[in-house]
Interface confidence: medium
């Protein structure tokens, strides 16, 4: 039996700059029941606070709701482990919520097969920003990628679309069913998960008109 090993803050993420969660990896428990607490202070403040919500984001996590989240303020976050033999603390993590955004995937992914005047067909892919993202006000600047592949293929073909929420894909195989997904990334932050797959079959004989 021994004091607990040093915990490590594994990651912190925000879906929207309005709330965020931090997760930690416990160290060794020293063979004894071990309690974990997350404490934090904000830059320029002397007060130390305890995690406001250990439940919402699951085990070994702390959820900061709107009332506990400020942007452009550095949070100095530490996880403490305590058992009967002693205690240990993680290295402090200095977190700026602005930079840890991992948004929800884009939504309303729609696929349309179109034809140019020269009879060349293409796939028109359109989508909307994630619901929580206030793109119009400039609160978020979002970049997007789409990926697609024939249903049976293993390799995805990825296209970066910049700030565009639509993209035209040419030179697809007629008669082939394609799977398409999209994802987004804020100006500072992480790529979202890929959206749910949408599928479309490229026609063998295209007779529709624009």
């Amino acid at each position: 039996q021994s004091p607990p090993g040093k915990p490590e803050i594994h990651k912190c993420r925000s879906p929207d700059k309005e709330t965020f969660t931090c997760w930690w990896n416990p160290g060794t428990d020293g063979g004894l029941p071990t309690n974990y607490s997350l404490t934090y202070s904000k830059e320029g403040e002397k007060t130390t606070y305890e995690c406001p919500d250990y439940k919402t984001s699951g085990p070994n996590s702390c959820f900061f709701s709107k009332q506990y989240t400020s942007i452009w303020k550095i949070y100095i976050i530490t996880v403490n482990a305590t058992n009967q033999m002693g205690s240990s603390s993680s290295d402090p993590l200095y977190v700026d919520v602005t930079y840890i955004v991992e948004p929800e995937p884009p939504r309303n992914l729609t696929l349309e097969v179109k034809q140019l005047k020269d009879k060349k067909t293409y796939l028109w892919v359109k989508w909307s920003p994630p619901t929580i993202t206030d793109v119009k006000t400039g609160w978020f600047t979002m970049e997007y990628e789409i990926r697609l592949k024939p249903e049976e293929a293993e390799e995805w073909e990825i296209h970066f679309t910049g700030h565009q929420t639509q993209f035209k894909v040419f030179d697809l195989y007629p008669g082939q069913k394609y799977l398409v997904q999209t994802r987004c990334k804020p100006d500072h932050g992480y790529w979202s998960r890929w959206s749910q797959e949408s599928s479309v079959e490229m026609p063998n004989d295209f007779t529709l008109k624009d």
């Epitope: 452009w72 550095i74 290295d91 200095y94 700026d96 602005t98 930079y99 840890i100 932050g189």
Partner: antibody
């Protein structure tokens, strides 16, 4: 414990090349921006380069732009500085440092290595 | 480039005295996001620099509260309320608001 260990320094002739490495441990390397800073024999400090946590964004001052390249291998937890067309004024102690803030933000070199010495002389 | 000018170059003090180091930038170092990325570093003899203060006035973890930073715009000050022997070394200011990031020339704190 955050640890940064530089290597690869030495004596090189003007016009020559050298590649510095910085082995990082004690933290999730891919979560942090990294910097190279140098200190001249006269003890003045100069920021030389930075690289974003994923490696997609780099920046250099004009004094080294086009001659130095910062890169990283997140799988190996290692930062690099490729220096070419070296000049005598590049003679310095080269330090790698880790951004204090998790993921983005700016500045604040919270952790430094012990440095590796580069001498450019014929 | 933003020029960072430190004064004095050398600061002789007696242990227990207050010390004050000034740093002036050639232009405002308020970033477009409203923050001021002004930092102070201490380099003790034979060691690499260590971060003391970030964003003008925030002490890095483990830095004693006798160190304090203040200022805004272009004028910044580092104060040490009661100098101890372990505080001796060269102090550098640094701006991380505008690229290229730049250091001051340093202030050597030494025993009178």
């Amino acid at each position: 414990e955050v640890k940064l260990v530089e290597s690869g320094g030495g004596l090189v002739q003007p016009g020559g090349s050298l590649k510095l490495s910085c082995a990082a441990s004690g933290f999730t390397f891919s979560d942090y921006y990294m910097f190279w800073v140098r200190q001249t024999p006269e003890k003045s400090l100069e920021w030389v380069a930075y690289i974003s946590n994923g490696g997609g964004s780099t920046y250099y001052p004009d004094t080294v732009k086009g001659r130095f390249t910062i890169s990283r291998d997140n799988a190996k937890n290692t930062l690099y500085l490729q220096m070419s067309r070296l000049k005598s004024e590049d003679t310095a102690m080269y330090y790698c440092s880790r951004q204090l803030f998790y993921y983005g933000s700016r500045g604040a070199m919270g952790y430094w290595g012990q440095g590796t010495s580069v001498t450019v002389s014929s | 480039d933003v020029l960072m000018t430190q004064t004095p170059l050398s600061l002789p003090v007696s242990l227990g005295d207050q010390a004050s180091i000034s740093c002036r930038s050639s232009q405002s170092i308020v970033h477009s996001n409203g923050n001021t990325y002004l930092e102070w570093y201490l380099q003790k003899p034979g060691q690499s620099p260590k971060l003391l203060i970030y964003k003008v006035s925030n002490r890095f973890s483990g830095v004693p509260d006798r160190f304090s930073g203040s200022g805004s715009g272009t004028d910044f000050t580092l104060k040490i309320s009661r100098v101890e022997a372990e505080d001796l070394g060269v102090y550098y200011c640094f701006q991380g608001s505008h690229v290229p990031f730049t250091f001051g020339s340093g202030t050597k704190l030494e025993i009178k």
